[in-house]
């Protein structure tokens, strides 16, 4: 807390200029009017000041606006942004997503802070949902956004908004979130061709279920390994050998590397060796032949 | 450029443990397997176990029955590799080896880890 | 597990000269399954043939490998002074992976 002091003589702030950057904290405290600082947002980023002169600043601004900061002040806050805290944004309605773009610019580069997760928390909640517009930004400053979402929270994305998304912008994402964004992927994608359609919703795949594996596996998709592997085992597990041959195509022959991997084990696990025998692989681990395989899961089912 | 950059050097004493992380840049993670593969004092190479980045899922060299755990960090792009009751005979250099999912040879080496264990 | 077993131990050649070195399985490795690596002093491995036969990306020409089932070769052609270092194989046809304990080709 800065002591109150009167403003020496000649030293009162007309505008927010380089000048100020020679006050020391008290002056800076006595002598900048918080309304001309608030009118004058843009220029702070301009100016040198040092951390301990940005606290009076921010200080000034803070009485100014017990309630919370208008938008036009937010959106000028440049550096000062890194100053503010969680509960300091909180008290913020964000409706502009140039404002936003503005504030997360002041964090490029750097992990997502609490400041900035409370920002956007506030900025989604504000909006309602989660719009193409906003995860286009979001996701270019932090590709690994969606994926911080809970699948509550990605249930409000709208499938026109699954365009914006890139496959790196969901590589953290586990089963659970991809189980809610594939059937919106899905939808968003239903009316492009099948080649097209597979480069899209490839990044989605661990979420499909079983009867869209099969349907996939009929069209000349040649899924990679990597795609393959990121699949739900439950999903897998009932396809034959001809659908995960039809599946991969030429690149079938790399369940070899990674039978020793979920799903890939567990799927060979299921399989009989005569029907493995027949990739040529040397996969091992199938049902020998002359046993009887019973679907006690089938039979609890009946019963 | 694609890189995998190791940890320092480490000494250690016998029953304690070490953890050397591998951090990659310049490629898409999840795509590749991370393997690990030592290699003893004026000695051959030796696998030691592989990860999948994408789901975490591990596959380890029976020899090293429960002592190797590896683990990834997606956020950073690094793998980690623990050996625990380390002996002196786990005394060598461990390379992490890039392997593209789906193929069984490593394209791309770390630097090496010196791993000494002495009392 | 399966074990290779690389000969000679060590090979003593001249710049120019052709190098052949072997590989052998203690049982069948798929061909797909087999690589070859180079190793100098103090530097980490580098892959040099992937699938028995295929080249890797920026190896020279002059390197070559060829073998089915038990029996493999990795060849150079003429030897580069760059060449003369420590080379092992390695399968992944048969789990624990394996690598062969080397062979060494040093300046005559």
């Known amino acids: 807390e800065v002591e109150k002091t009167a403003c020496p003589s000649g030293k009162k702030a007309r505008e927010i200029d380089e000048s100020l950057i020679f006050y020391k904290k008290w002056e800076l405290e006595a002598c900048v009017d918080a309304a001309l600082l608030a009118t004058q947002m843009d220029r702070v980023n301009a100016i040198p000041f040092t951390y301990e002169q940005l606290d009076v600043l921010k200080h000034k601004l803070d009485e100014l606006y017990p309630q919370g900061y208008p938008e036009s002040v937010i959106q000028h806050l440049g550096y000062l942004f890194l100053k503010m805290s969680p509960e300091d944004i909180r008290k913020w309605n964000v409706t502009s997503l140039e404002t936003l773009k503005a504030l997360l610019e002041v964090n490029k580069g750097h992990e997502m802070s609490p400041q900035v997760a409370t920002l956007i928390d506030r900025f989604v909640k504000g909006r309602g949902q989660l719009d193409k517009d906003t995860l286009d930004t979001l996701t270019a400053f932090y590709p690994g956004y969606l994926c911080s979402l809970s699948p509550e929270e990605l249930s409000s994305v709208p499938p026109s908004s699954i365009w914006a998304v890139r496959p790196q912008d969901l590589d953290t994402c586990d089963p659970r979130q991809l189980d809610v964004l594939y059937p919106k992927a899905r939808l968003a994608f239903q009316n492009m061709n099948g080649s097209e359609y597979f480069v899209k919703i490839q990044s989605f795949l661990g979420g499909a279920p079983t009867e869209d594996l099969k349907a996939l596996s009929q069209q000349n998709v040649s899924m990679d390994l990597a795609t393959f592997m990121k699949l739900r085992t439950d999903a897998v597990l009932p396809l034959t050998v001809a659908e995960v041959q039809k599946l991969l195509g030429p690149h079938v022959e790399g369940l070899k590397a990674e039978e020793r991997h979920r799903p890939v084990r567990d799927w060979i696990l299921r399989q009989r060796q005569d029907d493995l025998d027949t990739l040529g692989l040397g996969l091992q681990g199938g049902i020998p032949n002359g046993y009887l395989v019973l679907d006690l899961s089938m039979q609890e089912a009946l019963s | 450029e694609v890189q995998l950059v190791q940890s320092g050097a480490e000494v250690k004493k016998p029953g304690a443990s070490v953890k050397v992380s591998c951090k990659a840049s310049?490629?898409?993670?999840?795509?590749?397997?991370m393997d690990w593969v030592r290699q003893a004092p004026g000695q051959g190479l030796e696998w030691m176990g592989d990860?999948?980045?994408?789901?975490?899922?591990?596959i380890y060299n029976q020899k090293f029955n429960g002592r190797v755990t590896m683990t990834e960090d997606k956020s950073t792009s690094t793998v980690y590799m623990e050996l625990s009751s380390l002996r002196s005979e786990d005394t060598a250099v461990y390379y992490c080896?890039?392997?593209?999912?789906?193929?069984?040879?490593?394209?791309?080496w770390g630097q090496g880890t010196t791993v000494t264990v002495s009392s | 597990e399966i074990v290779l077993t690389q000969s000679p131990a060590t090979l003593s050649l001249s710049p120019g000269e052709r190098a052949t070195l072997s590989c052998s399985a203690s049982?069948?490795?798929?061909?797909?399954?087999l690589s070859w690596y180079q190793q100098k002093p103090g530097s980490s491995p580098r892959l040099l043939i992937y699938?028995?036969?295929n080249l890797a990306s920026g190896i020279p020409a002059r390197f070559s490998g060829s073998g089915s089932g038990t029996d493999y070769t990795l060849t150079i052609s003429s030897l580069e002074p760059e060449d003369f270092a420590v080379y092992y194989c390695?399968?992944?046809?048969?789990?624990?992976?394996?690598f062969g304990g080397g062979t060494k080709v040093e300046i005559k």
């Open positions: 080896a890039r392997r593209r999912i789906g193929t069984g040879y490593f394209d791309v």
């Open positions: 390695h399968q992944w046809s048969s789990f624990p992976y394996t």
């Open positions: 049982s069948s490795v798929i061909s797909s399954y």
């Open positions: 699938r028995t036969s």
């Open positions: 990860i999948n980045p994408s789901t975490g899922g591990t």
């Open positions: 310049g490629y898409t993670f999840t795509d590749y397997n």
